[in-house]
């Protein structure tokens, strides 16, 4: 089955590499624009130059194309942590990441926040921290892990998963306790 | 203790419109990031949108962009989420939460309001 193609694929594919179909006379195909401009006007023939325009501040285009507007710089989103690593050029959108000792958690395709890396506090570093993974930790004896932190045992109630973990503090517990009660 | 009740689900034809709700209560919500979530049946949690502090710049999944507009009301503790042109993958129990702070979970957030949309 030969994979459907929107309109534009489709008028893309009849030209060759680098040049598009003229969207009033398909008989023609237009050079795209370099990165960092947009299409203004169409090319008037074979043969001739396509007008391109370079993108206004606060705007770009990443790679060769033939759009009627470049594209809107994106902004870092300050309420998520993040902070611009490199700022928007003509041919590249800003780049946002996170402060140093941070990692990404990506909340969905197209937005991420920053947290701090977990410290591994009673337990010991099993993986650094990465651009996009949290430190994974491992919790000393007598502490489980919980939300990324080693959190001691007496903190353990029965109906939490940490029961396994913390298994035989929690029978020393119980057992000091009836042993108190004779 | 931070309290987040949502109101304002509830059954609507596929083209139609809802106002959802947040109260906020247990906590100064003129300081914080208010993130609206939603669950659809067998789902995970999808991040839907979210609104700083000020009201400023909010923002949008892809797939609510265009339709769906956040807002908020500093004086009266509460958030909004206008949905119109609703569709039926838009179905979802919708939570409304606090901006998390500490790890990627969420502290606090309400018990949801459904949204059932019929095409």
């Known amino acids: 089955l030969v994979p459907h193609l929107g309109d534009r694929e489709k008028r893309d594919s009849v030209c060759p590499q680098g040049k598009y179909i003229h969207p009033q006379n398909n008989s023609i195909c237009c050079t795209k624009c370099h990165k960092g401009t947009y299409l203004y006007n169409d090319c008037p023939g074979p043969g001739q130059d396509t007008d391109c325009r370079e993108c206004e501040s606060g705007s770009f285009t990443a790679s060769e194309n033939h759009l009627r507007h470049c594209l809107s710089c994106s902004k870092c989103r300050k309420e998520m942590g993040q902070v611009e690593i490199s700022s928007c050029t003509v041919d590249r959108d800003t780049v946002c990441g996170c402060r140093k000792n941070q990692y990404r958690h990506y909340w969905s395709e197209n937005l991420f926040q920053c947290f701090n890396c977990s410290l591994c506090l009673n337990g010991t570093v099993h993986l650094s921290c990465q651009e996009k993974q949290n430190t994974v930790c491992t919790c000393h004896a007598g502490f489980f892990l919980r939300e990324n932190e080693c959190v001691s045992c007496s903190n353990c109630k029965k109906s939490l998963e940490c029961t396994k973990l913390c298994l035989p503090q929690i029978e020393n517990v119980k057992g000091t306790e009836d042993s108190g009660t004779t | 203790e931070v309290q987040l009740l949502e109101s304002g689900g509830g059954l609507v034809q596929a083209g139609g419109s809802l106002r959802l709700s947040c109260a906020a209560s247990?906590?100064?919500?003129?300081?914080?990031?208010m993130v609206w979530v939603r669950q659809a049946p067998g789902k995970g949690l999808e991040w839907v949108s979210h609104?700083?502090?000020?009201?400023?710049?909010?923002f949008y999944a892809d797939s609510v962009k265009g339709r769906f507009t956040i807002s908020r009301d500093n004086s009266k503790n509460t958030l909004y989420l206008q949905m119109n042109s609703l569709r039926a993958e838009d179905t979802a129990v919708y939570h409304c939460?606090?901006?998390?702070?500490?790890?990627?979970?969420?502290?606090?957030w309400g018990q949801g309001t459904l949204v059932t949309v019929s095409s």
């Open positions: 939460a606090l901006l998390p702070k500490r790890g990627p979970w969420f502290d606090y």
């Open positions: 247990g906590f100064t919500f003129a300081h914080e990031t």
């Open positions: 609104i700083p502090p000020d009201g400023q710049d909010p």
